[in-house]
């Protein structure tokens, strides 16, 4: 069982337990911050990020941000707390096992973002319309 002095941790956001006292392990996410990308006009892309990290806090999820402007294309992969906005946007899809890109309005660039909560799920980013959340099959996957 979990030692009592671990549960009485000062920094309680680092420890999340269920009713049986089991401690939640953080998400495993691709974490390369911002890198140049060749991902363009594809249904899905791999992140080409070789770094998988244990997220710092148990509540964090995996996030990917794809940006295109006149100069370049970048892909950002990070861990982030879904209770907090990222790039001024709420992570609406944090419970999804897949990282399904949704376009966000940003002046001067094309901006897509996704979030998800399965191992290294931000390694495979999906742009295809067939994965739109209006698809009942996807909702089944997400909420199973």
């Amino acid at each position: 069982t979990i030692p009592p002095h671990v549960q009485k941790s000062v920094n309680n956001d680092m420890i999340v337990t269920d009713n049986n006292g089991a401690v939640k392990f953080p998400q495993l996410c691709k974490f390369c911050d911002v890198r140049f990308s060749t991902c363009d006009n594809q249904k899905s892309c791999m992140s080409n990020c070789s770094i998988t990290s244990i997220c710092e806090k148990p509540q964090e999820v995996c996030v990917a941000v794809w940006r295109k402007n006149d100069e370049n294309i970048t892909l950002e992969t990070v861990c982030h707390d879904p209770k907090l906005p990222y790039h001024d946007f709420i992570l609406e899809d944090a419970a999804s096992p897949k990282c399904i890109m949704k376009e966000k309005k940003k002046p001067g660039e094309t901006f897509f973002m996704c979030s998800c909560s399965s191992d290294e799920c931000n390694d495979n980013i999906i742009f295809s319309e067939e994965y739109n959340t209006s698809n009942p099959d996807l909702l089944l996957v997400i909420f199973q």
Epitope: T1, I2, D18, N20, G21, A22, V23, K24, F25, P97, S117, S118, Q144
Partner: nanobody
């Protein structure tokens, strides 16, 4: 009864090395992911490293990447943490922990059994 017993902690100078061991009993060791976590004095729990049941996949926190190596010997029911290039901020009680369920896939990892910990002090 599940038991996890850590050993190998102690006092080491900055830049030094230590190898922690965790002897497991009371469950089928090779079926379960195992992890190391640590708690520095007055701080929260920090997950350090995770290893898959068969030992082929390993993961690390950014703070220890490139310095720590997790491994396991399933024939000896033992988990290891090799710690190199130790820093003062690595000072903590180190715990090994067992994943609650053996299943993989889209399920939240939860760890239900913990050792009592071994103290690592990095100081000159």
């Amino acid at each position: 009864e599940v038991q996890l017993l850590e050993s190998g902690g102690g006092l080491v100078q900055p830049g030094g090395s230590l190898r922690l061991s965790c002897a497991a009993s009371g469950f089928t060791f090779f079926n379960y992911e195992m992890a190391w976590a640590r708690q520095a004095p007055g701080k929260g729990l920090e997950w350090v490293s995770l290893i898959s049941a068969e030992g082929t996949r390993t993961y690390y926190a950014d703070s220890v990447k490139g310095r720590f190596t997790i491994s396991r010997d399933n024939s000896k029911n033992t988990l290891y943490l090799q710690m190199n290039s130790l820093r003062a901020e690595d000072t903590a009680v180190y715990y090994c922990a067992k994943r609650r369920d053996a299943s993989m896939g889209h399920t939240t990892r939860r760890f239900d059994y913990w050792g009592q910990g071994t103290l690592v002090t990095v100081s000159s």
